[in-house]
Amino acid sequence: KSPVFGPQEVSSVEGNSVSIKCYYPPTSVNRHTRKYWCRKGASGRCITLVSSEGYVSSNYAGRANLTNFPENGTFVVNIAQLSRDDSGHYKCGLGINSRGLSFDVSLEVSQGPELPNGTEVYTVDVGRTVTIKCPFKTENAPKTKALYKKIGQTSVLVIDSRNYVNPNYKDRIRLRIPGTGQLIFTVVIDRLRLSDHGLYLCQAGDGSNRDEKNADLQVLEPEPELVYEDLRGSVTFHCALGLEVANVAKFLCRVNSRETCDVVINTLGKRDSAFEGRILLNPQDKDGSFSVVITGLRKEDEGRYLCGAHSDGQLQEGWPIQAWQLFVNEESTIPRSPTVVKGVAGGSVAVLCPYNPKESQSLKYWCLWEGAQNGRCPLLVESQGLVQEQYEGRLSLLQEPGNGTFTVILNQLTTQDAGFYWCLTNGDTRWRTTVEIKIIEGEPNLKVPGNVTAVLGETLNIPCHFPCKFSSYEKYWCKWSNTGCQTLPSQDEGPSEAFVNCDENSRLVSLTLNPVTRADEGWYWCGVKQGHFYGETAAVYVAVEEKKVAGSRYVSPAKADAAPDEKVLDSGVREIENKAIQDPRLFAEEKVVADTGDQAGGSRASVDSSSSEEQGGSSK
């Protein structure tokens, strides 16, 4: 007995479609071997019509496909525009037609139900609205109008002009009789159910003079749109369900193995924990359409997704739905980058963000995912240099290392910085990625003064102590502005006493400002890097005051003050929305930090070698 299983008999009518699902044991060999659908000829040979390797016979061109679902151990053959000629004996199978594992399927395509003459056919998707038009003659204008459903040989009253409504259609049907002169009445059925499918009869009047019109209503399930996305990438489901449900709760759900649909996210605040940090439901437009973005795609995200509308925020019969079949390509063009980056309180992280290397000129963005309600992602920084106010002095987006990767550095970390962040551009939306920042126990590796007050016109020397493990790294100082961090000359001053457990390789690198000017006020970063890969950073704020005492100042960690208070954000934040693909601005207006001035002047010195730290502190 073959372990392949499927429908032994399939019957349909001309013009219809069939979807034949064949099941196989999902062993490693079976999952990857060729799948086929062939037709058995008189000679006993089975001629391939469609296969998983992309072959489609001329007879099936444009109307058939075969899709393998290796995780489920199934493949599906879809055949559209059936004709009587398609009737016959077929096999669905694995391997080679003549000696592989297979299952016999008989397909019978008939002419279809004989419809009475003059029958109007209405083809509508489930959950949508149909308007059935029913003409009548003048003499029947004052008489009763009705719609019946034909079930076998009987006719069941659905609605009439005497206010009768069949309980199966309660609250979703209405009969409209126009003003004088218009010889047509209409029946509108909302939220169509699959059970509404069938033959209907409009009737006006009674007896031999009555007017009758037949209507064949075909209620269809939506065909899933096939969506192929890369592992680690992003997918956007655009859901347009129509104005009728514009004010009804929306949802996205995923069909499970029992063929029920588990809510992934809805507008009532429900969200599947498997999508934490990597999903957004974008607010709907006036027409009721909305979209759901999922980033950081995993293989297990594959499957059938439905979006819909219902007051309960979940799938219910008779409400409009849209369907997708998501495939996640494991041979991804999106490079691996850490999904979790760890940093210590007071320390820093450097996050590597991938982007499509063909779009090097695209604007780069970094936003903070917020889970409240439908999820949102307020923009924190962008490559044009705009930084949200409360991140002033501690956040920077760098174009390096380039060629498909940019870097985001966040320092002065606190436990409040833990969370999910998204890397994105105004270009290819499929390259959106998610990274989680975790704050762990530990001490920052770089030590700088907390707060420095410099005297106008004098010399300021700011030390940055680094441990021996960074001895081979390039050290740098830079002056932060909302357009980046401009590198400054610094002085490697030899051994440091800040790391008592370290040998003579523990050093300090100093920044000297000579003479101090008003323009020198602002944030300075000390950091380490290796080539274009950034490691840890430490930030210090320099305040400039009028000269009180002559002489130069050398600031050591012992004299450091607390960091200055952060500014409070009082403006609206910009967030990801549907326009992300086309609109380089991406998000709604917000207040922007003023540029903190020109780079500092002063003495210049050479810089040491270079580096990037492991995942505690950088994304290398």
């Epitope: 399939v10 499918h197 399930e221 063929e259 649909c261 799938l315 369907a323």
Partner: nanobody, 129 residues
Framework: QVQLVESGGGLVQAGGSLRLSCAAS????????MGWFRQAPGKEREFVAA??????????YYADSVKGRFTISRENAKNTVSLQMNSLKPEDTAVYYC????????????????????WGQGTLVTVSS
Amino acid sequence: QVQLVESGGGLVQAGGSLRLSCAASGRAFSSGRMGWFRQAPGKEREFVAAISWSGHTTYKYYADSVKGRFTISRENAKNTVSLQMNSLKPEDTAVYYCAARQSLVAGGDPRGQSEYDYWGQGTLVTVSS
């Protein structure tokens, strides 16, 4: 709520025929799946046959042990599914259960009991040798 009521069971001689019917009440099944399972004394419940439909398209599935002998069919107007059993064998003796599901999405493997939402009480078929 959907109720499923089986009928047509009884005692029959080997080689004989029986026709089981399953009537679904409480909800229109214009699209979905209905199936037959059976449980012989001391054995686990097993798949016999199933029928899935949507609009004018129907899919019929059979267990290898009944292929060519049993035929499943559906009468839309009466909301019933029948199982015509020919060439009955003593090993067909079992309680036969009707099962049904209605879903907006295509079903999974029809042989799986978890695929069905509603079950009947069962009807006994005894085939004597």
